[in-house]
Interface confidence: medium
């Protein structure tokens, strides 16, 4: 009967660096002739082991082939590399000149298991902005067998890739994978991560992960606001420029005065928000006594090499108020003056005329009357310092408010003159902590005759610190 060559395993998987055995048995030692092992078939097949001749350092017999009647021609390959992958054939030859092949085993395919490299996630070269779609690519290489799973996640949510390819498509010793996913950025993504997860038989259900921090790929531009704070003293106006919720930190802030650079800020102490973005506040003290004309202050913010964001704020000079008046400020986020300035001035003039007419009318009534009467009027002070100003404009107010400075010393106040019984006395109560409604437009007439005094004991207590302006009007 014809000799039969048996290779029991159709395939075997072995880890790179490990050893494997390729089994081969024959049913007869006849006809006389050697057994050889080859990888591959045809002309290009490679001799792996020949028991009688040649030097094969990593291959050796499993059993003792020198023993009589040995029919086991299994071989052991040590320190397997991915290049050892392929189909191995145990082939029986008949001795001759040359030897002739008479029978071959069915072949055993050797799969060399190789771990994938840690996945590398790459993103766009330039930072994207919220609502922009950006692509991320994940690459891993050097794995075998070809079967592999790749998943994308953003903050725990699985994402669907645009495409995933494993190359080469044919048989190879090892393979590479590349996958692309599209992510829509949002302003809350500074702390977000995009994760590429690779699972392979060699990893024991412990996937490899590649991580891209979106903080490296996102730009959140700041919102810039200029506001005016309450004056700390007579001749100072505090301007604040606030850049909010920006990322990355790279920020330059410049104050300009009528278009000329006044101060350059390189922010150091940024405050960090929980979403990973930053805030920065720059204070600018304006010396009001130095300006008689209107001044446009500009806060110019350059973020992450992007075009500058500018916010203007107009401060009206002395020419717009009484001799003792403090400066007025107007937010102006355009290059031109805010129309509110003109509307405000018009309203102020109109009210001034009305007040003058009212004053004249009162004087006429007083002249007619034989006996005086007392009436009381209250004017609300909106901000902190009642001493210095009667009205501070909120930068968000739409209406223009013109005001005069009471400029009263804080020291010892003169004792109030006792009003005569027939005098007409009016009280202007200036209460701290109360903010006027934006629609209240106040214009004050000349207060030559105003005397400021501590409030006399009142029938009911005042809700906050109050000062009274007592206006004495003599009856003619």
């Amino acid at each position: 009967t014809e000799v039969k060559v048996t290779q029991p395993e159709k395939s075997v998987s072995v880890a790179a660096g490990d050893s494997t055995i390729l089994n081969c048995t024959v049913t007869s030692l006849l006809p006389v002739g050697p057994i050889r092992w080859y990888r591959g078939v045809g002309q290009s097949r490679l001799l792996i082991y020949n028991q009688k001749e040649g030097h094969f350092p990593r291959v050796r017999n499993v059993s003792d082939t020198t023993k009589r009647n040995n029919m086991d021609f299994s071989i052991r390959i040590s320190n397997v590399t991915p290049e050892d992958a392929g189909t191995y054939y145990c082939v029986k030859f008949q001795k001759g000149s040359p030897d002739t092949e008479i029978q071959s085993g069915g072949g055993t395919e050797v799969y060399v298991l190789a771990k994938p490299s840690p996945p590398e996630v790459s993103g766009p070269a330039d930072r994207g902005i919220p609502d922009q779609k950006v692509n991320f690519t994940c690459k891993s290489h050097g794995f075998s067998p070809r079967n592999i799973t790749l998943k994308w996640f953003k903050d725990g949510q699985e994402l669907h890739p645009l495409e995933t390819t494993v190359n080469p498509s044919g048989k190879n010793v090892s393979y590479n994978i590349s996958s692309t996913v599209r992510v829509v950025l949002n302003s809350m993504d500074v702390n977000s991560k995009v994760i590429c997860e690779v699972a392979h038989i060699t990893l024991d259900r412990s996937p490899l992960r590649g991580i891209a921090n979106l903080s490296n790929f996102i730009r959140v531009s700041p919102t810039v606001k200029v506001t005016q704070q309450s004056p700390t003293s007579m001749n100072q106006v505090n301007l604040t420029c606030r850049a909010e919720r920006f990322y990355p930190e790279d920020l330059q802030l410049i104050w300009l005065e009528n278009g000329n650079v006044s101060r350059n800020d390189t922010p150091k102490n940024l405050t960090k928000n929980t979403d990973g973005t930053y805030n920065y506040t720059s204070l600018f003290l304006v010396n009001s006594s130095a300006h008689r004309e209107d001044v446009v202050f500009t806060c110019q913010v350059k973020h992450d090499q992007q075009p500058a964001i500018t916010r203007n704020h107009t401060v009206l000079g002395f020419a717009h108020s009484s001799d003792q008046g403090s400066m007025q400020t107007f937010p102006d986020n355009n290059a031109t003056h805010n129309w509110n300035v003109f509307i405000g001035v018009g309203v102020a003039c109109a009210l001034l005329v009305v007040l003058l007419m009212a004053a004249l009318y009162l004087l006429r009534i007083k002249q007619k009357k034989a006996k005086g009467s007392t009436s009381s009027t209250r004017l609300h002070e909106p901000e902190k310092n009642a001493r210095e100003i009667t009205q501070i404009q909120d930068t968000n107010d739409i209406n223009d408010i013109t005001y005069a400075d009471l400029n009263l010393p804080k020291e010892k106040k003169p004792a109030p003159r006792a009003p005569e019984p027939n005098n007409h006395t009016e009280y202007a109560s200036i209460e701290t902590g109360k903010v006027p409604r934006p629609e209240d437009t106040l214009t004050y007439a000349d207060l030559d005759m105003v005397h400021l005094s501590r409030a006399q004991p009142a029938p009911k207590p005042e809700p906050s610190f109050s000062e009274y302006a007592s206006v004495q009007v003599q009856r003619k």
């Epitope: 052991r76 024991d204 259900r205």
Partner: antibody, heavy 120, light 107 residues
Framework: EVQLVESGGGVVQPGRSLRLSCAAS????????MIWVRQAPGKGLEWVAS????????YYADSVKGRFTISRDNSKNTLYLQMNSLRAEDTAVYYC?????????????WGQGTMVTVSS | DTQLTQSPSSLSASVGQRVTITCGAS??????MHWYQQKPGKQPKLLIY???NLEAGVPSRFSGSGSGTDFTLTISSLQPEDFATYYC?????????FGQGTKLEIK
């Protein structure tokens, strides 16, 4: 003659640790993958962990992952199983076995086993 | 994970009888199915590897067949020393699962 001898078993309280050893002889230890299999009293066989000859490929059963660690010292021809955070359900006879060359081959030689009892 | 189900769970047979034990896999394990014999108080012993290959030193009355998801261990003529518990095991991919075992008893 191929021999595998396990040691290190005993009675231990839940939450405690134990380290099992398996001394190999009669074959080239560094050529073979090794495994641990356990058998709870009156129950079937359960594969616990395996390690390739070069220690580059290690696998665990879900039931022990994160608690047990398989390792080997080829210079000492010894296989180890470090068992931490032991539970009552880990009570079993633990066998070490040799895996014939290659991932897909069977476990051709087994040790006699060592008993681990987890009890308070 | 690949689940292996052996049937029957237990079996009573007489010496000289032909016995067949089957093992079903929840998914294909190709030909990477092995059979072990275990006697009480002893370690398991390899009988058949890669579905149909007889391990060295194992009597020829033991044979195995099958591929994919269905496998069979056959003992052509039961001998007194064959009464034991038999397990199938797959090594296609980790975790390397075992069947629940088939206990073969003397009738």
């Amino acid at each position: 003659e191929v021999q595998l001898v396990e040691s290190g078993g005993g009675v231990v309280q839940p939450g405690r640790s134990l380290r099992l050893s398996c001394a190999a002889s009669g074959f080239t230890f560094s050529d073979y993958g090794m495994i641990w299999v356990r058998q709870a009293p009156g129950k079937g066989l359960e594969w616990v962990a395996s390690i390739s000859s070069s220690s580059s490929y290690i696998y665990y059963a879900d039931s022990v992952k994160g608690r047990f660690t398989i390792s080997r010292d080829n210079s000492k021809n010894t296989l180890y199983l470090q068992m931490n955070s032991l539970r009552a359900e880990d009570t079993a006879v633990y066998y070490c076995a040799r895996r014939y060359y290659g991932f897909n081959y069977p476990f051709d030689y087994w040790g006699q086993g060592t008993m681990v009892t987890v009890s308070s | 994970d690949t689940q292996l189900t052996q049937s029957p769970s237990s079996l009573s047979a007489s010496v000289g009888q032909r016995v067949t034990i089957t093992c079903g896999a929840s998914k294909s394990v190709r030909t990477y199915m092995h059979w072990y014999q275990q006697k009480p108080g002893k370690q398991p012993k390899l009988l058949i590897y890669s579905a149909s290959n007889l391990e060295a030193g194992v009597p020829s009355r033991f044979s195995g067949s099958g591929s994919g998801t269905d496998f069979t261990l056959t003992i052509s003529s039961l001998q007194p020393e064959d009464f034991a518990t038999y397990y199938c095991q797959q090594s296609n991919e980790p975790p390397y699962t075992f069947g629940q075992g088939t206990k073969l008893e003397i009738k």
